[in-house]
Every structure is written in C-alpha cells, then in structure tokens.
C-alpha cells in the first residue's frame, strides 16, 4: 500500500509489491500515543546531542562535484587523515584506522558515538517522514534500475551478521537517482521487530511499519566504500516498508526460506541469484528523498535516502519467519534491529510527487510548506 495521507490516484495493482491504497489515518498513532517500546532499548540512554562532540568543529570537506546529493550539508563529519598511500582518505567515520566497528549492538553499551563519533552527527538516519511537510520536487524523476534481474548462478551470499540478514550483491546492478547520479548496488539487508511489534527504521507520522528493506549503493564516482563514507552522495540507500498482506511474497520467500540455515550469528549460506527488483515496490516514480546517514555504526553522513511511497506486502507467516528465526549476539534473538528516529535538524525531506496534498474532504487547500531544493531545479 501507499504511505498514509497521500494523494489518491488509481491503484497500481498489488503483485509482490503490494497494494497502492492509502492507510487510514486512524491507523496512525500520534507521536505522543506511540508506545516507546517500539524504539530499541538503550538509544534513549545516549547522552543528549549537546553532550556529544559537535561535528561543526570538524573541518569541512567539499564534495567532489556540486551535483552529488541534493542537500549541501555544512557540517559533515569529514576529516582528511593520512592513511593508504594511494589517495587521502576520509577518516571521520572512525577514530583511528584500527578501530573495529563490529563491536556494537542495539541497545545498551557501548553507546554508538563511542563506537563511531559520526553517530552523534546532526544529520542522522532514520527519520520520521511527515508527508505534509515534504517538498514536492518535480525534478525527482523515476528511479532507473539496470541489471537487477540476476541469473540463478553464480550464487549469492546470505549472511546473518548478528545485526541483520544481508545479501551481498555482485557487480553489474546499476541504479540512477537521476542524470549523472549513478550508483552500483552493494548489498541489501532488512530491519524488523518482534511478535506484535513493528520494526521499520523510518516512520511515517510516527507510524512504524512491520519491517523495512534497505538496498545499499555506492556512487560510481567512488571506487570503494571507505572513500565514499561521509561524502555527500557517496552512498545511496533505497528503502521500502514491508507490510502484512494476504498472500505469500514469492520473491521474499527465496530468502526467507533459507533463514533457518543461518540462524546462528555469523553463519552464512549461498542462495541462487534472483530478481532483486522484485523485492522492491513496483512504483519507482513515487518516493521521498533526503540526505542522512548509515543507520548503524559507522553512521557516516552524506547518504542519500530514497524511501518508496509504495510498500511491499508479505504474508503474516513470512513476517513471523523474518522476526523469529535468527539469533544475534549473546544467545539473544535477532529482533527489534532498528535505530530510533533521529531529528531532522532543519533538513527538508523531498518528495517526487505532491505528497502534502490531502484529498480527503477536510483539506480545503493543499498544504505544501517547504520548497524543493533538488539539484537541477
């Protein structure tokens, strides 16, 4: 289905990508009413932003090209430091080269800013999306995906890394956010909740969805993730909400049916290649976009987030399999693996469609409070 409070239009049809009907507003808990238990434990225990090292003190690093990313963030956590002999590296996402960012968890210690200082940044992800406040940007064209339909061979690695289930993608999956904004898909992973508890990372007007898929991409302007971290537009993530529907999703079943094999933290298996685009909504034209960060350490900023308006439907059994099969660190179930939403701190979320227009009878005038900042306008 579509996200709440969207302009009505004709349904695009369900299929594996879900229906395109709007959620009723009565389904949306208000911010005050939403139970705090939906947020992962521990994040509230982090010191307030004013208690953390401010990134505005770090030297600014200009993006390599003015067209990388739609927002020009002034205080990205980017520090040039000597490292590899080939080229200077952007090292702000770690304290020193030897730091091991694998030792973190959802909730409890260590606080993420101690694992990676960038986690205390001002422009973090995930965020709460409020369609009424989104800026309609006609310049945001439909996403273009090429090479996402993979043959069965060679097989792909499906891994339980203790934080999520991750499918590593081969070279050749190309994605364009627009002209000159080209990326290659690196991996996809999921975030989920627990029985009766939703676990998406992004929320919409405070509403948390059952689960969320992230497809992580590297800009073709960069050779490696290490060089792209913290650079505006260096990484881009396509995100879609997963919801409960009446039918089994055959695309997701190809992965979910293999989860038992990787129940143990650190375990992995090989799965036949599949149509990666079938894991995403079918409507590539309607989405929200903003500049944020990785949602796990190293929390590097400059990440372009594209959150689909249309959701993906999985059966109740599939959502249960997702949230109830894997184990994480310390003999605990791998559940509720989402980060609490982060403040926008002045960022404007852009929409590729007039998301702020409410077609219900109560809205006499369309409300569009923010103007478009998209590159190319």
């Amino acid at each position: 289905q579509r996200l709440p409070r969207m302009q009505e239009d004709s349904p695009l049809g369900g299929g594996s990508s879900g229906e395109d009907d709007p959620l009723g507003e009565e389904d949306l808990p208000s911010e005050e009413d939403s139970p705090r238990e939906e947020d992962p434990p521990g994040e509230e225990d982090l010191p307030g932003e004013e208690d953390l090292p401010g990134e505005e003190d770090l030297p600014e690093v200009k993006p390599k090209s003015e067209e990388e990313g739609s927002l020009k963030l002034e205080d990205l956590p980017t520090v040039e430091a000597p490292g590899d002999p080939q080229e200077p590296q952007n090292n702000a996402h770690r304290d020193k080269e030897g730091d091991d960012q694998s030792h973190w968890r959802y909730g409890g210690d260590p606080p993420w800013p101690r694992v990676s200082p960038a986690c205390a940044g001002r422009f973090q992800s995930p965020v709460d999306i409020r369609p009424q406040l989104a800026a309609f940007c006609p310049a945001l064209r439909p996403l273009e995906l090429l090479g996402f339909q993979l043959p069965p061979l060679p097989e792909l690695r499906l891994r339980n890394n203790g934080h999520s289930v991750q499918l590593t993608l081969p070279p050749g999956l190309e994605m364009a956010l627009g002209p000159g904004r080209e990326y290659r898909a690196l991996q996809l992973h999921l975030h989920w909740g627990a029985a009766g508890r939703p676990g998406s990372e992004h929320t919409v007007e405070g509403h948390r969805f059952p689960a969320e898929i992230h497809v992580v991409h590297l800009s073709t302007a960069f050779a490696r993730v290490d060089e792209a971290l913290g650079r505006p537009g260096g990484l881009a993530v396509l995100a879609a909400f997963l919801e409960e529907g009446p039918e089994e999703n055959s695309a997701y079943e190809q992965l979910l049916s293999r989860l038992e094999e990787i129940a143990e933290e650190g375990s992995e298996t090989q799965v036949p290649g599949l149509d990666i685009s079938a894991l995403l909504p079918s409507d590539f034209s309607r989405y929200f976009q903003y500049e944020g960060s990785l949602t796990t350490p190293p929390c590097a900023q400059g990440v372009i987030w594209t959150v689909f308006n249309q959701t993906v439907m999985l059966s109740a059994k599939q959502l249960h399999t997702l949230s109830d099969t894997l184990w994480g660190p310390g003999d605990s179930r791998l559940q509720l693996n989402f980060r609490a939403t982060q403040p926008l701190n002045g960022r404007v979320i852009e929409a590729s469609f007039p998301a702020g227009v409410d077609s219900s009878p109560r809205a006499a005038e369309p409300v569009q409070l923010n103007s478009c900042l998209a590159a190319g306008d």
């Epitope: 080269e97 090479g147 891994r159």
Partner: antibody, heavy 124, light 111 residues
C-alpha cells in the same frame, strides 16, 4: 609502516601438511581483506583464495579442499592440506589497499602491500 | 567462475614507444580490476587500481581504461625500467568461491 610477510618456505614431502603464515604489522586484520596467491617457477600468478575482515574464506575452484585459509588477530594462515609436487611455487600474501567494509558488500579493487613471497618445494 | 583473458602474452617495444595490454573479464566486474608489474625475484607491485586509478608511486606514462568488460593497460613512452611481466586481477565477489582471477600475464621486452 604497513607490511605483510610470509613465513619462511620449506621443503616438504608429498602428503605432509604444511602451514604458511602471513604476519602483518602496522594495521588491524579485523578491518582488512587478505589474499593468498602463488606462482609456480616460470609461470603466472594464481589466485588461491581470500579471507575477509569477518574471517570468511573463499577459494578458487581448483584450490577448494586443497587449501584452508584462517586468521588470528595478527596473522593469516594458509594450510596446504596434502601437498603434491604441483604445489611447488612461491606463495605470496597481499592486503586489500583500503579498509574493507564487508558488511556493505565492498569489493577489493587492488592489493597493496604484498609480502616478498616464500618458496615452497614439494619433493620426495 | 571468473576468467580473465589477457593478451598478448608477450610484446616488444622500443624505448619511447607505446605498449597496450588487454584483459577481458568473463562477466561484469565493474571497476574491480587492478594491474600489477612484476620483475624477476620480486613480488607483484600494484600499478593501477579501480581499473584506471594510478597508485601514487606510478609514473604518469602508465594508464588504465575500461570499456564494458574489457580493460586496457597502456604504457606511453616506454622506458627500459618498464621491462617486466604485467598481470591483471579481476574481482567479481569475495563472498563466493571462484570470485577472483588473474590474467595469464604479459611479458614486456624493451629494445
């Protein structure tokens, strides 16, 4: 300075297991991918296998079952399970040129530094 | 299985001339290709990474390019010191077996 170095090579008889060790200095193995490569006398370079920062190892098809790659915090081992005379070669280890982000599907696009290599001779 | 086909196996060039070495991947490897120079008794030395980027110690007469699954190493204005064997290395995956492969090598002889 960052470097890798293979342990001294040996003369072994066929069938006698042999472990080569790549010792690293100046960087943390927990953040880098390493490869093992070999070169028979007068021949080209042959990729044996790779171990990523999370300790997962993968091999060339011809090498699977014949070699095992593992690591500790400062060393990467290459075990030749049952050497044959065809395994006579100089063995090299090399490191991915930048920090590896395996959890992000990162792939190596070049290897540096390389060890000086060590000669293994398998002969009866 | 990734296969890297390198041509030619040997090439001769006069000082100041140009040498072109090609590598073709059996499947898409994007820019995950590197070039190495090896002299007798020495380990390989990284010349070019990410298909076209020069390592900091490499003279500007070396260059790398990519067109689809075909990769080219060019030495313009060959010097005596460039006499060596050159190898390409392609990486398709480090999360499956058979995910990387070297080309067969090209011996460059400088006259």
């Amino acid at each position: 300075s960052q470097s890798v170095k293979e342990s001294r090579g040996r003369l072994v008889t066929p069938g006698t297991p042999l472990t080569l060790t790549c010792t690293v200095s100046g960087f943390s193995l927990s953040r880098y991918t390493l490869i093992w490569v070999r070169q028979a006398p007068g021949k080209g370079l042959e990729w044996i296998g790779i171990i990523d920062s999370s300790s997962s190892a993968y091999y060339a098809r011809w090498a699977k079952g014949r070699f095992t790659i593992s690591k500790t915090s400062t060393t990467v081992d290459l075990k030749i399970t049952s050497p044959t005379t065809e395994d006579t070669a100089t063995y090299f280890c090399a490191r991915d040129r930048v920090l590896s982000y395996d959890d992000y599907g990162d792939l190596p696009d070049g290897f540096d530094p390389w060890g000086p290599g060590t000669l293994v001779t398998v002969s009866s | 299985e990734l296969v890297m086909t390198q041509t030619p196996s040997s090439v001769s060039a006069a000082v100041g001339g140009t040498v072109t070495i090609n590598c073709q991947a059996s499947q898409s490897i994007s820019n995950y290709l590197s070039w190495y120079q090896q002299k007798p008794g020495q380990p390989p030395k990284l010349l070019i990474f990410a298909a076209s980027k020069l390592a900091s110690w490499v003279p500007k007469r070396f260059s790398g390019s990519r067109s689809g699954i075909e990769y080219t190493l060019t030495i313009s204005g060959v010097q005596c010191d460039d006499a060596a064997t050159y190898f390409c290395l392609g990486v398709y995956s480090i999360s499956t077996d058979d995910g990387a492969a070297f080309g067969g090598g090209t011996e460059v002889v400088v006259k």
